[in-house]
């Protein structure tokens, strides 16, 4: 009985249920392709349970295998808009520590206005994920069109 | 020993493993943009473990953070077909209770025939999810082309 | 105390946390539409924890409901490339045992160069998943552009 009670009182984070869902805050200055994210109940339906934001980039707090997912929609976009510009590409990767820098997920907008994907990947405590949008088109800040999240799956 | 046995005998639903995967049943009448879903082993590979269907819409039975995913393919579609019609958009949202109404996920078919995406979002017991397909193109009913599901991730 | 220790010493696989993320190894010979996958830490960020590879195809080791996800990008592709060829389609399905053969997930590249999707589906021990790419375009082997994975979700 005492064991069951103790188990119930453990914080969820100790069970490894780290999870985050972020919404777009802003794009970077001209030479910075990174998207800057924000999260928290005050902002709507975004949240961080475990991971943290470091200058708009997502930092992992627990080692494990994560499901990383993202959707980015270009602002005021039609297939005509998309086809009239140089290819726009989104890449999600570990950007720090530099020793672990790697691209995890990459997609191009080919005459389309939205990309969406997901993948499983091992992440370590301290890994910071960056989402780089290359091209000159502005992403939508609508929370149902552009979002980025991670979910801890197993050690 | 008794504790371990008791734990094994708990129904899975009490562990919070609510999950559902649905297949398209039919579209609504002309002025109703909602897609109507169905699920159950008799229908193939669709199922509901926890959530329920209410007139073809998915109702949540357990509070928590959920992974919501969807794929919709337009019927007898080619990029030519898609480009000949006005933009078709899919939106997944909470449609009831009205006080919690919000769009969670939105994608347009831009000269494409399939949209697919997923996101993490908090849902509460009693939330009903609706999937609205605006535009005049009929979605495919093939179970490997059009489907909609949720998975409970954490409290 | 002894119970807690025993619990910690159980292998993760016994908790049902089967998971795999694979990278493309090669395509099949001309009349074989299957993609052949590989996985393991020596190859980068791919891994198999529970499921196994059988001649480049993914074999399931534990009954349950799985989240299956995939992304495939066509090599040296632009929307022009994609539109100039016969439709290229990706299908993920159970290919053996033959008695359980079924298509689970199907997407076409319509003037696009990448498809990405995911779904929940029941899988049984011994099910082998095949990913068939029909058409004459070569998929990218970049690990951030083409990948395939499964995650055990619940019994």
């Amino acid at each position: 009985q005492r064991f069951a009670q103790a188990q119930q009182q453990l914080p969820l984070e100790s069970l490894g249920w780290d999870v985050a869902e972020l919404q777009l805050n802003h794009t970077g200055p001209q030479q910075d392709p990174r998207l800057y994210w924000q999260g928290g109940p005050a902002l709507g339906r975004s949240f961080l349970h475990g991971p943290e934001l470091d200058k708009g980039q997502l930092r992992i707090h627990r080692d494990g295998i994560y499901m990383v997912h993202i959707q980015v929609t270009l602002a005021i976009c039609s297939s005509t808009t998309a086809s009239r510009h140089h290819p726009t590409t989104l890449a999600v990767g570990i950007c720090s520590p530099a020793s672990r820098s790697i691209s995890l997920l990459r997609l191009s907008f080919h005459q389309g206005c939205t990309i969406a994907s997901q993948r499983l990947t091992p992440l370590a405590r301290g890994d910071t994920l960056c989402t780089n949008l290359t091209g000159t088109l502005l992403p939508s800040r609508n929370t149902d069109e552009t979002f980025f999240g991670v979910q801890w799956v197993r050690p | 020993q008794r504790f371990a046995q008791a734990q094994q005998q708990l129904p899975l639903e009490s562990l919070g493993w609510d999950v559902a995967e649905l297949q398209l049943n039919h579209t609504g009448p002309q002025q109703d943009p909602r897609l109507y879903w169905q699920g159950g082993p008799a229908l193939g590979r669709s199922f509901l473990h926890g959530p329920e269907l209410d007139k073809g819409q998915l109702r949540i039975h357990r509070d928590g953070i959920y992974m919501v995913h969807i794929q919709v393919t337009l019927a007898i579609c080619s990029s030519t077909t898609a480009s000949r019609h006005h933009p078709t958009t899919l939106a997944v949202g909470i449609c009831s209770p009205a006080s919690r109404s919000i769009s969670l996920l939105r994608l347009s078919f831009h000269q494409g025939c399939t949209i697919a995406s997923q996101r993490l979002t908090p849902l509460a017991r009693g939330d009903t999810l609706c999937t609205n397909l605006t535009g005049t193109l009929l979605p495919s009913r093939n179970t490997d082309e059009t489907f909609f599901g949720v998975q409970w991730v954490r409290p | 105390q002894r119970f807690a220790q025993a619990q910690q010493q159980l292998p993760l696989e016994s908790l049902g946390w089967d998971v795999a993320e694979l990278q493309l190894n090669h395509t099949g010979p001309q009349q074989d539409p299957r993609l052949y996958w590989q996985g393991g830490p020596a190859l980068g960020r791919s891994f198999l924890h529970g499921p196994e590879l059988d001649k480049g195809q993914l074999r399931i080791h534990r009954d349950g409901i799985y989240m299956v996800h995939i992304q495939v990008t066509l090599a040296i592709c632009s929307s022009t490339t994609a539109s100039r060829h016969h439709p290229t389609t990706l299908a993920v399905g159970i290919c053996s045992p033959a008695s359980r053969s079924i298509s689970l997930l199907r997407l076409s590249f319509h003037q696009g160069c990448t498809i990405a999707s995911q779904r929940l589906t029941p899988l049984a021990r011994g099910d082998t998943l095949c990913t068939n790419l029909t058409g004459t375009l070569l998929p990218s082997r970049n690990t951030d552009e083409t990948f395939f994975g499964v995650q055990w979700v619940r019994p």
Epitope: - | T27, T73, A75, I76, R84, G135, T136, L138, S140, R141 | -
Partner: antibody
Framework: QVQLQQSGPGLVQPSQSLSITCTVS????????VHWFRQSPGQGLEWLGV???????DFNAAFISRLNINKDSSKSQIFFKMISLQPNDTAIYYC??????????????WGQGTSVTVSS | DIVLTQSPTSLAVSLGQRATISCRAS??????????MHWYQQKPGQPPKLLIY???NLESGVPARFSGSGSETDFTLNIHPVEEGDAATYYC?????????FGAGTKLELK
């Protein structure tokens, strides 16, 4: 209520062109596609072409070089033109509204038909 | 192009009896979970009237005496019980792809 009203000549000289106007009411041409057909004793019902809600057109390959369809959505009118008519083009010509679903291609309302005779 | 073959070319049925008309396509018109076959009724001097869409769905306002069935390449229109106003020519039409094509028609007469 939904209506499609056709107007056009009954007699056309060989090698001349045929113009028919289909004026619609009860629905918008920015939402619905309109197809064109003809019916003759020899050929039965033939699909000629379609103008989609977006203004894009598709034609039967057998008529593509002789056919043009355009519209003025603000006036609820579709204009059908076929050139170089021959006696075997004698038929009743119909416009028909595509049902609500753009990829269904079933006609839920039809014009009354324009009987065309090609003769000198 | 998909060729539709209707049979019979004509039939005579007594009031209250069943009329059955067949339509065979030269290739499958089933796709995306639907059967892209429709049925029309045409009376002399009038345009065709949609009766059944997607093989088995009754168009609004059409009596339930009309029913359709079939899939892939073989489709059937049933009228039961036949009434006086049903004397007409019936056409099948596919919409699996462009160009749309019609069957040659089946003329239903009342005995």
């Amino acid at each position: 209520q939904v209506q499609l009203q056709q107007s056009g000549p009954g007699l056309v000289q060989p090698s001349q062109s045929l113009s028919i106007t289909c004026t619609v009411s009860g629905f918008s041409l920015t939402t619905y596609a309109v197809h064109w057909f003809r019916q003759s004793p020899g050929q039965g019902l033939e699909w000629l072409g379609v103008i989609w809600s977006t203004g894009i057109t598709d034609f039967n390959a057998a008529f593509i070089s002789r056919l043009n369809i355009n519209k003025d959505s603000s006036k609820s009118q579709i204009f059908f033109k076929m050139i170089s008519l021959q006696p075997n083009d004698t038929a009743i010509y119909y416009c028909g509204r595509n049902s609500y679903y753009g990829n269904l291609y079933a006609m839920d309302y039809w014009g009354q038909g324009t009987s065309v005779t090609v003769s000198s | 192009d998909i060729v539709l073959t209707q049979s019979p070319t004509s039939l005579a049925v007594s009031l209250g009896q069943r009329a059955t008309i067949s339509c065979r396509a030269s290739k499958s018109v089933s796709a995306s979970g639907y059967n892209f076959m429709h049925w029309y009724q045409q009376k002399p001097g009038q345009p065709p009237k949609l009766l059944i869409y997607l093989a088995s769905n009754l168009e609004s306002g059409v009596p339930a005496r009309f029913s359709g069935s079939g899939s892939e390449t073989d489709f059937t229109l049933n009228i039961h019980p036949v009434e006086e106003g049903d004397a007409a020519t019936y056409y099948c039409q596919h919409s699996r792809e462009l160009p749309l094509t019609f069957g040659a028609g089946t003329k239903l007469e009342l005995k």
